[in-house]
């Protein structure tokens, strides 16, 4: 039950995380115009991974796509790539995890197969979350660098009287959405990996083994180790695994001088 809950919760958390990563990637507010300590303008600028927008005080908003590919900064391209990889991996992970869910029956799928699929989707979610966090962090670092560079020469004098105000950009809402979403996807992935351990076939799940002695039989109840007297084949207290243990119907013991009551 706990395994199913962990797996289900991991799936839901990852689903929310990936939805968040998609939302962050599509959002226009990755960087927003810094309003602090800036001359008050009637225009507000903000930028996303795919386009930049300007909102006038009149309410009019105008967005322009980055129609060039080669002209864009390498860092922006890298962030785009990381976010897309994160989305793709997350989407595949979601698809795999749906079939891996314990509560969903698909034919006669073995628990071991479900465990492997759960682990696979968990790893995919972890990598997806890391990609998103990395992408957002790279962009944030880029913003911080540019912010201080533009602060250093915020007012570039032009012939004494005339001044040009440089627009500074700070963290936009998409960055926080991306960080949270990446974190959720990561947590969901970890939960899936934990659930995978519980889904794997139990190694301590044994069947009762009985031995037939001459005249009467002594049945041994399953317990981690077989009771040993120092005789027989299990002299070293080896663990009896499911694969090796055989049932009463399968094994017929023959009388021996070592039989005991």
């Amino acid at each position: 039950m706990a395994v199913t809950a962990c797996q289900g919760l991991g799936f839901v958390v990852s689903l929310i995380g990936i939805a968040g990563i998609i939302a962050a990637t599509c959002m226009d507010q990755w960087s927003t115009q810094d309003l602090y300590n800036n001359p008050v303008t009637a225009v507000f600028n903000y930028q996303g991974l795919w386009r930049s927008c300007v909102r006038e005080s009149s309410g009019f908003t105008e967005c322009r796509g980055y129609f060039t590919l080669l002209g864009l900064p390498a860092m922006l391209q890298a962030v785009r790539a990381l976010m897309i990889v994160g989305i793709v991996l997350g989407a595949i992970g979601l698809l795999v995890s749906i079939f891996a869910l314990k509560c969903i029956r698909i034919g006669s799928m073995e628990d071991s197969a479900k465990a492997n699929m759960t682990l696979t989707s968990g790893i995919m979610f972890i990598v997806s979350g890391l990609c998103a966090i990395a992408g957002v962090s790279v962009f944030a670092n880029m913003l911080v660098t540019n912010f201080w560079m533009s602060t250093a020469n915020m007012y570039t004098g032009m012939g004494g009287m005339v001044q040009t105000v440089q627009t500074r950009y700070t963290f936009g809402a998409a960055l926080f959405v991306g960080w949270v979403a990446g974190g959720l996807t990561l947590i969901g992935g970890v939960m899936m990996c934990i659930a995978c351990r519980g889904l794997a076939p139990e190694e301590t799940n044994y069947k009762a083994v009985s031995y037939h002695a001459s005249g009467h039989s002594v049945a041994y109840k399953p317990g981690g180790f077989k009771a040993s007297t120092g005789f027989g084949s299990n002299t070293k207290n080896k663990k009896i695994y499911d694969g090796g243990a055989r049932t009463e119907d399968e094994v017929q013991s023959y009388p021996s001088k070592h039989d005991y009551v």
Epitope: N45, C53, E56, S58, G59
Partner: antibody, heavy 119, light 113 residues
Amino acid sequence: QVQLKESGPGLVAPSQSLSITCTVSGFSLSNYGVSWVRQPPGKGLEWLGVIWAGGNTNYNSALMSRLRISKDNSKSQVFLKMNSLQTDDTARYYCARHGYGKGNAMDNWGQGTSVTVSS
Amino acid sequence: DIVMTQSPSSLTVTAGEKVTMNCKSSQSLLNSGNQRNYLSWYQQEPGQPPKLLIYWASTRESGVPDRFTGSGSGTDFTLTISNIQAEDLALYFCQNAYFYPFTFGSGTKLEIK
């Protein structure tokens, strides 16, 4: 069609306050910003302040302490209240609408109301 | 506050001529986000309220004759009126629509001979 009409007292005594109402038609104040501009006789234009669609205001820094702009969307009215009037506040007061997608420019103006500050 | 300086303060021309008037701002009115200049031009005929001619420094308001052309970027702007007509007798103002407070130039008075 778009119309703006100012209505004011005409004559105001020095140190008194001025209240002007701008009644608009043909558009909604919940979608457009309205500015107040004045023009002293024979002089240029002076921007006083603006109230945007969302209700946020910006004022001329020189007049900020004695100026207040408000509006009533349901009545399609914008109000200008100015305190401590002096003789140099004598001017024609205009209200003007900020066009949408026109670079914050004022695309429609009222005819203005003349205000004389005199004892 | 942004200072808008207009020159000349007055112009006298004959009908059919071409005229240019200048406007200079103390800070750049160019917004880097959309590469637009937030400068407007207004025409005020005697006894009338101002009328919008040009916004974004070069975009003509609908209904404005194409004889009126706005140009310039950053801090230096120009309004050109070609083939001047008698009805163009008016005051022309430039306005900063980028920084608060919005400020107007002192105006250029256009007179017809």
